[in-house]
Interface confidence: low
Amino acid sequence: EDLKKVFPPKVAVFEPSEAEISHTQKATLVCLATGFYPDHVELSWWVNGKEVHSGVSTDPQPLKEQPALEDSRYSLSSRLRVSATFWHNPRNHFRCQVQFYGLSEDDEWTEDRDKPITQKISAEAWGRADC
Amino acid sequence: PYIQNPDPAVYQLRGSKSNDTSVCLFTDFDSVMNVSQSKDSDVHITDKTVLDMRSMDFKSNGAVAWSNKSDFACTSAFKDSVIPADTFFPSPESSC
């Protein structure tokens, strides 16, 4: 692998659609990790500081953003579904964390070049009672 | 897995104001339905995956489409998949 060509992911959480909430009484948050290379990532959801597995579905493998390119960057998506009540409780805090492994020439966090470094990147959301 | 009460729907999700990515969620569809990849290289569509809400004994299929294109719309995101016309739920304008 070309260790100079490492791109960490951009992570964003997308909040549930009010249409889904009113129609199903459930709320789905989507986490997108995009633009990363190579494809070594681990994605996890954290609710109120604890990792959750129930209600979570993550792509089994990252998607090539440009399938025609051999060294295309990758994306990964994940869904977290909770009850509408749980989403609307403003005390509830949702975080999608992506761990990215890699080395790069200009990343400040690469201190030891012999070992892969774990970079934690996360995006967060709070339950909403209002705007 | 067997989905007890399929209720296919496509919802538009909102990110932060600074995020120019649009995300569409296709969810609650029957397991026999397949999700096709986009022919547009700027539109990304995931394979379907199963989500299990164990506490509610509820399973659902889902797929996500997203793009940075300014004209990207959820009504056309899954146009290469066979989706009923009444599946699309417009995203209400934010009152914030």
């Epitope: 964003a12 959480v13 909040e15 109120n48 403003p90 005390r91 805090h93 995006a123 967060e124 959301a125 709070w126 909403r128 705007c131 | 932060s16 600074s18």
Partner: nanobody
């Protein structure tokens, strides 16, 4: 926009105490999460303590039993009371605020805490 200004850092002997303050200004009514983080020389920034709406708190293992996070809503201020300080607590301490909708994430400039005899 939200601005965060930390204060209260300084030099203290092992076993001593300090109280850090973080004053928030701007659109503070949108904030419902505050946190204290620290970064020691040559190390990654790490969580120390969080406080959220309803005053729910959460501490890093290294802070449990020694540090207390609190807030005074009327003063838009978050505090970190640090007792039984150790040399390994030496770091730049940052205040963080998160607004209702991600990823409106704000950080202060930091205040330096040095624990040394």
């Amino acid at each position: 926009e939200v601005q965060l200004v930390e204060s209260g850092g300084g030099v203290v002997q092992p076993g001593g105490s300090l109280r850090l303050s973080c004053v928030a200004s701007g659109y503070v009514h949108k904030i419902n999460f505050y946190g204290w983080y620290r970064q020691a020389p040559g190390k990654e920034r790490e969580k120390v303590a969080h406080i959220s709406i309803g005053d729910q708190t959460d501490y890093a293992d290294s802070a449990k039993g020694r540090f207390t996070i609190s807030r005074d809503e009327s003063k838009n201020t978050v505090y970190l009371q640090m007792n039984s300080l150790r040399p390994e607590d030496t770091a730049l301490y940052y205040c963080r605020a998160l607004s209702r909708i991600w990823p409106y994430d704000y950080w202060g400039q930091g205040t330096l805490v040095t624990v040394s005899s």
